[in-house]
């Protein structure tokens, strides 16, 4: 979380960043808000990048403004217009690209001041991996798969019965490039399983950390998993 | 000096419509939301939606949504807000005020009677 | 919806004492809150916006503090005129919400 305040002139006001990542390919946001203000038509957003000549997006008197917008982000970029009213400057951002990671900064005026603050946006492929029960293996054998992944991540096998074991000498890990060039599909296979137990298959980089775990018994399979994006941290 | 003025006291059948509007002195109207929030009688505050004509969005307590309509008169710097399908518990005083988020600036109320 | 509890209800004080309410948020609103003054018969009147900050004219003896969830109103010596009914709203959040109010009395 990052909290700028405001600058010379007029009173300084509080806005609030959160650090974030976006999937690439998807539609990311871009955290921020500030201190609503009853005067609706005072209100400014502003989005820079560092290292980029135009802006990234402008809202002002009620509607984008995006005549000084920067090539890169033309079409791609808006504001929740019906959440400025309660203080919410978050920026929409379509079709994330690789290129869009950097330094960001969340700039507002309103008629109680000014005030900015900073976000790092990072970018990469995160996915929900799935774990399945390999049937055609000669053993009884587990197979995660997760099918977009960037930058390559590590991959860990846990068990909730062998608790600190090391799997890393019974799995094999392969990423095999998708058809843009860029993400990898990332497939673990695991060995030598057993049933009454349950497996966790553990895919992490630096924005993203995934699990899908699975739990074999004599009668039923059962499946779980999540996502956590990492260094979500407010500004 | 900002002033929020309303229109008069209605007396309406159950099932019927009613039309209020609230004119707004200053540059209220091309600045700020108007939002109306109702009464009822010997209760609290409740707020029933608002619109925001610089960014031409409306928007409406789900209580509400399909029943009241708001709309501004930039022109004539007027909000109207109309009721559909009333019923008797809509009996309240109607307050249209400046704002959100926050209201500053208050008419006078009107007081909608639904009674058969 | 977000949903605003008052408490007390009614509040009893002797003029010249101190009286303190409270607001509470079933979530967060951060400082998003503000404080309103109703007398019978009248409109309400914006005593307090951003938790804190008293809206123009407002006497300097009413005082709001309080951010995320928990907010109090404060007059710190209570004027014959401030006998009314006081509410909280906020704001973080569409819709807008206020709480049921609290009935500030004569002892």
């Known amino acids: 979380l990052i909290i700028g305040f405001g600058i010379s002139g007029r009173h300084s006001i509080t806005v609030t960043t959160v650090a974030s990542a976006g999937n690439i390919g998807e539609d990311g946001i871009l955290s921020c808000t500030f201190e609503p203000d009853i005067k609706l038509s005072d209100i400014v957003i502003q989005w820079l990048k560092e290292g980029v000549l135009g802006l990234v997006h402008e809202f002002k008197e009620g509607k984008d403004e995006l005549s000084e917008q920067d090539e890169m982000f033309r079409g791609r970029t808006a504001v929740f217009a019906d959440q400025v009213i309660v203080g919410n400057a978050s920026l929409r951002l379509k079709n994330v690209q690789l290129t869009d990671a950097g330094t960001y900064k969340c700039y507002i005026i309103t008629s109680k001041g000014k005030g900015n603050a900073n976000l790092e946006y990072k970018t990469g492929a995160f996915s929900m991996p799935e774990v399945n029960v390999d049937y055609n293996a000669s053993s009884e054998t587990l197979r995660c798969e997760a099918p977009r992944w960037f930058p390559q991540p590590t991959v860990v096998w846990a068990s909730q019965v062998d608790q600190g074991a090391n799997f890393s000498e019974v799995s094999n890990t392969s990423f095999e490039l998708n058809s843009e060039n860029v993400t990898m599909k990332v497939v673990s296979v695991l060995y030598n399983v057993t049933i009454n137990n349950t497996y966790s298959c553990m895919i992490e980089n630096d924005i993203a950390k995934a699990t899908g775990d699975i739990k074999v018994t004599e009668s039923e399979i059962k499946r779980r998993s999540h996502l956590q994006l990492l260094n979500s941290k407010a500004s | 000096q900002v002033q929020v003025v309303q229109s008069g006291a209605e007396v309406k059948k159950p099932g019927s419509s009613v039309k209020v509007s609230c004119k707004a002195s200053?540059?209220?109207?091309?600045?700020?939301?108007i939002s109306w929030v109702r009464q009822a009688p010997g209760q609290g505050l409740e707020w029933m939606g608002g619109?925001?004509?610089?960014?031409?969005?409306?928007n409406y307590a789900q209580k509400f949504q399909g029943r009241v309509t708001i709309i501004a008169d930039k022109s004539t710097r007027t909000a109207y807000m109309e009721l559909s399908s009333l019923r008797s518990e809509d009996t309240a005083v109607y307050y249209c005020s400046r704002g959100g988020p926050y209201f500053d600036y208050w008419g006078q109320g009107i007081l909608v009677t639904v009674s058969s | 919806e977000i949903v605003m509890t008052q408490s007390p209800a009614t509040l009893s004080v002797s003029p010249g004492e101190r009286a303190t309410l409270s607001c509470r948020a079933s979530?967060?609103?951060?400082?998003?809150l503000a404080w309103y003054q109703q007398k019978p018969g009248q409109a309400p009147r914006l005593l307090i916006y951003?938790?804190?900050t008293r809206a123009t004219g407002i006497p300097a003896r009413f005082s709001g503090s309080g951010s995320g969830t928990e907010f109090t109103l404060t007059i710190s010596s209570l004027q014959s005129e401030d006998f009314a009914v006081y509410y909280c709203?906020?704001?973080?959040?569409?819709?807008?919400?206020f709480g049921p109010g609290t009935k500030v009395d004569i002892k």
């Open positions: 951003g938790a804190s």
């Open positions: 979530q967060s609103v951060s400082s998003n």
């Open positions: 619109i925001i004509p610089i960014f031409g969005i409306t």
């Open positions: 709203q906020q704001y973080k959040k569409w819709p807008f919400t």
């Open positions: 200053g540059d209220t109207f091309s600045n700020y939301a």
